[in-house]
Interface confidence: low
């Protein structure tokens, strides 16, 4: 399997999503797990509802969201207010017994708020005003491979 | 996999007009910041416009060469960026390129041709 | 308007061995918030400019950690490690500090 990077910034939402086989898969529930160093074991951070009829219902394991579209083919994945000891390596997994089959690895990185954490506020293009003002951040868009609302640069 | 995908370019005489298309897939395209970034045969790049998210309210902003001739829009139902060029001049004749802004131009398009000559 | 300017215009390389280009801003592109609105870039021949480096230091997704950024505010520098035949092509500097944004001239790297 070759590595998904998904880039989120810090205190926003990221989203993960893993695509498979709907068919392949059908009536198997799936698992969020965290690699634990490059050859230890996926420690399971969240599953998917223990009704396989009931996977479109989300599941939270603290920050951490679940939820299958078993019909399309897409596991998702919401990590809520990234922080910077969420970045690592992923999988998403299909469960048949006790075994799991690897749907995707995952890269998870997260990138600093360009803001600093000052108060979002608009953005200027020159003309419009004589002095910089933030640029406004939108506190829950998740992208992966840099699509997330990335603050844009100060302008003066 | 993130697109951008250029079309319209041409040759115009000067004083000419011409629209510029760039079909965004891939991403959520109401969530970014789109530009385009021309570049005259045999030179280097230049910024031309800017294009805001639905956050800021698409707000456009121009490279003073191009302002009051050229205006940016999108159609977020189509997913689709625009260059309407007015009043082109010789000094226009470049490959355009629409490029997605986040940290920089993280994406390109292939570019499209745009030749103003009589 | 900022000026950027690069040298050298043009770079002779040997793979396997380091390149480094300059660029020189007619402003600072320090902010206030710690980041330096500096961005690289490389056009392969025939092909779209791709990021490779933003806030002067810091790698675009997918690019080779043989390509590295540094620099003050307003001298910068983009250096490989060893060059590779992938690597020609022409690399620009960019600001991201204040419309409008501007582009070096552009250094044009090639195999010796």
């Known amino acids: 399997h070759n590595t998904t990077v998904f880039q989120g910034v810090a205190g926003q939402s990221l989203q993960v999503s893993c695509p498979y086989d709907s068919m392949k898969h059908w009536g198997r529930r799936k698992a969020w797990c965290r690699q634990l160093g490059e050859k230890g074991p996926c420690q399971r951070v969240v599953s998917t509802h223990n009704l396989w009829l009931l996977s479109f219902l989300r599941r939270w394991n603290g920050s951490t969201a679940i939820t299958d579209d078993t019909l399309g083919g897409t596991l998702t994945i919401t990590l809520r207010n990234l922080q910077p000891h969420d970045a690592g390596l992923y999988q998403c997994q299909s469960l048949h017994g006790s075994e799991a089959d690897t749907l995707r690895k995952v890269l998870v990185e997260v990138l600093a708020d360009p803001l600093d954490h000052r108060d979002a506020g608009d953005l200027w293009f020159p003309g419009e005003s004589e002095s910089f003002e933030d640029a406004h951040v939108e506190h829950s868009i998740s992208r992966s491979l840099l699509e997330g609302e990335i603050p844009f640069p100060p302008t003066s | 996999e993130v697109q951008l995908v250029e079309s319209g370019g041409g040759l115009v005489q000067p004083g000419g007009s011409l629209r510029l298309s760039c079909a965004g897939s891939g991403f959520t395209f109401t969530d970014f910041y789109m530009s385009w970034v021309r570049q005259a045969p045999g030179k280097g790049l230049e910024w031309v416009s800017v294009i805001r998210n639905k956050a800021n309210g698409y707000t456009a902003g121009y490279n003073p060469s191009v302002k009051g001739r050229f205006t940016i829009s999108r159609d977020n139902s189509k997913n689709t960026l625009y260059l309407q060029m007015n009043s082109l001049r010789a000094e226009d004749t470049a490959v355009y390129y629409c490029a997605r802004l986040t940290y920089g131009f993280d994406y390109w398009g292939q570019g499209t041709l745009v030749t103003v000559s009589s | 308007d900022i000026v950027m300017t690069q040298t050298p215009l043009s770079l002779p390389v040997t793979p396997g061995e380091p390149a480094s280009i300059s660029c020189q801003s007619s402003?600072?592109?320090?902010?206030?918030?710690?980041?330096?609105?500096l961005n690289w870039y490389l056009q392969k021949p025939g092909q779209s400019p791709q990021l490779l480096i933003y806030?002067?230091?810091t790698r675009a997704s997918g690019v080779p950690d043989r390509f590295s950024g540094s620099g003050s505010g307003t001298d910068f520098t983009l250096k490989i490690s060893r060059v590779e035949a992938e690597d020609v092509g022409v690399y620009y500097c960019?600001?991201?500090?204040?419309?409008?944004?501007?582009f070096g001239q552009g250094t044009k790297v090639e195999i010796k």
């Open positions: 960019q600001q991201f500090l204040e419309y409008p944004f501007t």
């Open positions: 402003k600072s592109l320090l902010h206030s918030t710690g980041k330096t609105y």
């Open positions: 806030w002067m230091s």
